[in-house]
Amino acid sequence: AGVFELQIHSFGPGPGPGAPRSPCSARLPCRLFFRVCLKPGLSEEAAESPCALGAALSARGPVYTEQPGAPAPDLPLPDGLLQVPFRDAWPGTFSFIIETWREELGDQIGGPAWSLLARVAGRRRLAAGGPWARDIQRAGAWELRFSYRARCEPPAVGTACTRLCRPRSAPSRCGPGLRPCAPLEDECEAPLVCRAGCSPEHGFCEQPGECRCLEGWTGPLCTVPVSTSSCLSPRGPSSATTGCLVPGPGPCDGNPCANGGSCSETPRSFECTCPRGFYGLRCEVSGVTCADGPCFNGGLCVGGADPDSAYICHCPPGFQGSNCEKRVDRCSLQPCRNGGLCLDLGHALRCRCRAGFAGPRCEHDLDDCAGRACANGGTCVEGGGAHRCSCALGFGGRDCRERADPCAARPCAHGGRCYAHFSGLVCACAPGYMGARCEFPVHPDGASALPAAPPGLRPGDPQRYL
């Protein structure tokens, strides 16, 4: 057991052109915090895959407000280290993700909002108990400077925190066969419980008599470095004597990946692609629990009470993503009906309705005709958020106050002549055409294109339709 410690030194614009805008402003002051996620081994994993070695969240940094016109400086940082405790052996090789988050503190109804500002990732080798390692990582125009180390928690010591130390029973020396525990010279190595000869640097055990190897080491006592450079074939198990991979069955034979993981061969061995909620070399370990606080922006962590059940984040309205890290443009869902204007106020959506509509989503059609009168015998028709008059023959306009010229729109087709009439209009059709609007040709045999002429009218007669 031990602790991985991360010290953030600075977060600010990187060198070169295109300095980023400050994430904070006078209108929207903000403060930063950091999240670190650790995974064992050197596998290139997606940002969403679980933090198998552990995760930690920093405190909030000091509130920062941009000075108008000034370039974005290094931003004020939270105090203290980020500490990620690990229960088992330190793997020696690990992948990390460090996220910089911004907490907006503007006049937000319903509290602050969080958004991801930058994410850096890397893969490193690191022995526990060693000095601080310094690093610089860039994400877009931002630059993050930090140091990290892994240290063992007593009584564990060694580069993997697998050797145990105990206070000396006698003041002067350790018991038979036991060495002093460097660097704790006043303590003694605890009696070995691993298989005799198991490498104290590259092997460890969880059960008496076993010897399990850290990544990069092989052999029954974990004393042989894995190396493929002088080998003829990249397939098969490691030779305990040379560390070479000798020909043998394919590494994915029998699918070594548990819990529904899929296996793919790599130049050195195999790699498991694990389903959501599982991780590890063989997908044998389940993922982050709710205790790791994976949900942002007020999200509630559901499930994930223990490492065998995957968590889900229930996100507040306005956020989405597996960790509620993405802000949603709720207006893009076009929730306002009948042409209403959508406003996302953060704490709620508002719809500004067009005239004639009301309700939270402009869903109610108001009585457009209330108090409206249509002149000259017209009748009011609702619709479209504004009243409309259906006018009696001979009248037009919004309120049927205008006397209409029924021939103004040239309603008679094929050269027919239009006559205004007290009850509408009459079309006198040109030879060869008939119909109320002269729209039907008369066939040469005297039959018309109409199914039947109205009784009392011969084809070619002027027709008046009331």
Epitope: L57, G111, G293, C301, A305, P316, G318, A348, P360
Partner: antibody
């Protein structure tokens, strides 16, 4: 002004189903999560469950097998059904709105007392 | 589930005095997702504090919240007659949502 009003029978017989409705005014039921909380006489608060209009629900494991929460967006209402009730389910039942900044309760109904007795 | 333990069960004070109420969580509450409510007899609870320290709309500044991790505190700097009530804490870090057992602040 957001207002919530619970209603339903005040007396339910043991082994029957308790049914309550909460009418929401001043806020669209589609914009928030909505929850039910109960408080036995003289005791503390117990969260029952919540719902989002999309159908997402989450119930207290201690009540999960007996609880159903639903919403009717057209009426701006949510409802609670609790089956196989016993005297231990006698309580004041509150509906509440869940805030957008997190899963806490920013508006509450005045509560309705439901007594389970034969 | 996260169990919230409030102490003391009852706090007897006079108007004008300072009240300090404690809420302790059985597991760490991430991101300070903790709220405080006030409840008077025959009424529904009223939100006072969220995010451990942010005052809800319309809450007087004599109410303040603090703490992180497993230990949280609600402080009423000078008790007014209308502040005598029962106070509950609630965590909203993970499901199930849980409340503390309450602290009753009554008049000495």
């Amino acid at each position: 002004q957001v207002q919530l009003q619970e209603w339903g029978p005040g007396l339910v017989k043991p082994s029957e189903t308790l049914s309550l409705t909460c009418t929401v005014s001043g806020a669209s039921i589609s914009s928030f999560y909505w929850s039910w909380i109960r408080q036995p006489p003289g005791k503390g608060l117990e969260w029952i469950g919540y719902i989002y209009y999309s159908g997402t629900t989450n119930y207290n494991p201690s009540l999960k097998s007996r609880v159903t929460i639903s919403v009717d967006t057209s009426k701006n209402q949510l409802s609670l059904k609790l089956s196989s009730v016993t005297a231990a389910d006698t309580a004041v039942y509150y509906c509440a709105r869940i805030a957008v900044a997190g899963f806490f309760f920013d508006y509450w109904g005045q509560g309705t007392l439901v007594t389970v007795s034969s | 589930e996260i169990v919230l333990t409030q102490s003391p069960g009852t706090l007897s004070l006079s108007p004008g005095e300072r009240a300090t109420l404690s809420c302790r969580a059985s597991q760490s509450v991430n991101k300070n997702y903790l709220a405080w409510y006030q409840q008077k007899p025959g009424q529904a609870p009223r939100l006072l504090i969220y995010g451990a320290s942010s005052r809800a709309t319309g809450i007087p500044d004599r109410f303040s919240g603090s703490g992180s991790g497993t230990d949280f505190t609600l402080t009423i700097s000078r008790l007014e007659p209308e502040d005598f009530a029962v106070y509950y804490c609630q965590q909203y870090d993970r499901s199930p949502l849980t409340f503390g057992g309450g602290t009753k602040v009554d008049i000495k």
